[in-house]
């Protein structure tokens, strides 16, 4: 499987709430055996590799903002330090996987990954990452509602080597 | 956990023919399963594979000919005009994510005039 | 679609010696590292040895070994023995259609 991502960019006014997502892409195991872990962080363009970077988002870690569950199963995060955060983080049986974000401010632009790992016996068996910017702007010229800009058909699947 | 195909048997070109992979062990809701078949004296050549949603992917040569589908317990591999090149051993495996781990004895399928 | 080569055809090896069979894929394949090798006997089904291009399958002998990475894989059998005489064949993952290519195999002979 890979992960698509499929809007590149959310520009989105202050105030207004937003959901991030991503999706499972291939064959997907799902085993008796296998689990899935799967968290979103904040990042930056990195010259060598997007997303290498992992930075929290509104003060949550990705370990803060993580989904643990077996291949047939959707989760959600119901912890109520994300919820206190404005943040909730969601998987469903389709593998669609996303994250929301409760009245935005400047402070949440930037860009955001989310990250798949399929984890088999116990140890990380293969690892998968998509990248979206999120730009929430304020004044005359924000839009009045979230604008989502679709990924090209390459920049929708991004794919990171284990 | 174990894979079984049967179906496999003499036909004449042209004649459909469905083979049937049972497992047992593991359930198919969870399971990605592959088609592969190998001539005699030939190497190993993938069909293709149903995964968990159902969704058929198929190599290249393959597609418009075979046709992969499942029930509650079995997954079927649907042959149509068959000729003599089609003569092998066709095997059932379960496919993790990039490697099949677990494989059926296979069934031959043998077409001649 | 992507076409798997194996070398050599077919390797002869004695007893205790080491066995290096090479698998070149015409495009990388899945993660770069979407490579399995199996091992089969004849009138046996293939069995898995070494999954993404370097993770020895439970219960397999530490005496196989893989390793490479994009388009260049090598499995590595040292100490060979008796019951290592068999056909090994590599095969890629490709997630342009999630797909597999086998290669030839390479048939191992040991003496």
């Known amino acids: 499987f890979k992960v698509a991502t499929p809007y590149s960019l959310y520009v989105c006014p202050e105030g207004q709430n937003v959901t991030l997502t991503c999706r499972l892409l291939g064959p997907v195991d799902k085993g008796h055996d296998v689990t899935f872990y799967k968290t979103w962080y904040r990042s930056s363009r990195g010259e060598v590799q997007t997303c290498s970077e992992r930075r929290p988002i509104r003060n949550l870690t990705f370990q803060d903002l993580h989904l643990h569950h077996g291949g047939h199963q959707a989760a959600n995060t119901s912890h109520d330090l994300a919820q206190r955060h404005g943040l909730e983080s969601a998987s469903d049986h389709h593998g669609n996987f996303s994250i929301t974000m409760r009245n935005l401010t400047l402070l949440d632009s930037g860009l955001y990954c989310c990250l798949v790992v399929e984890i088999r016996h116990h140890h990380s068996e293969h690892r998968v990452h998509g990248a979206m910017e999120l730009q929430v702007q304020t004044g005359k010229d924000a839009p009045s509602n979230c604008v989502v800009y679709p990924s090209s058909s390459q920049d929708s699947e991004n794919i990171t080597a284990a | 956990q174990s894979v079984e195909e049967s179906g496999g048997r003499l036909v004449t070109p042209g004649t459909p023919l469905t083979l049937t992979c049972t497992v047992s062990?593991?359930?198919?809701?969870?399971?990605?399963m592959g088609w592969v078949r190998q001539a005699p004296g030939e190497g190993l050549e993938y069909i293709g594979l149903?995964?968990?949603?159902?969704t058929t992917y198929y190599a290249s040569w393959a597609k418009g000919r075979f046709t992969i589908s499942r029930t509650s317990t079995t997954v079927d591999l649907k042959m149509t005009s068959l000729t003599t090149e089609d003569t092998a051993t066709y095997f059932c495996?379960?496919?993790?994510?990039?490697?099949?781990?677990?494989w059926g004895p296979g069934t031959l399928v043998a077409v001649s005039s | 679609q992507a076409v798997v080569t194996q070398t050599p055809s077919s390797v002869s090896a004695a007893v205790g010696g080491t066995v290096t069979i090479s698998c070149q894929s015409s495009?990388?394949?899945?993660?770069?590292?979407?490579l399995s090798w199996y091992q089969q006997k004849p009138g046996q089904p293939p069995k898995l040895l070494i999954y993404?291009?370097?993770n020895l399958e439970t219960g397999v002998s530490s005496r196989f070994s893989g390793s490479g990475s994009g388009t260049q894989f090598t499995l590595t059998i040292s100490g060979v023995q008796c019951d290592d005489a068999a056909t090994y064949y590599c095969?890629?993952?490709?997630?342009?259609?999630?797909?597999?290519?086998f290669g030839g195999g390479t048939e191992v002979v040991v003496k």
């Open positions: 993404r291009a370097s």
């Open positions: 062990g593991f359930s198919l809701s969870s399971a990605n």
């Open positions: 495009q990388s394949v899945y993660n770069n590292n979407f």
């Open positions: 495996a379960r496919l993790r994510t990039g490697y099949g781990d677990l």
């Open positions: 095969a890629g993952y490709y997630s342009s259609g999630w797909y597999y290519t």
């Open positions: 149903i995964d968990t949603d159902g």
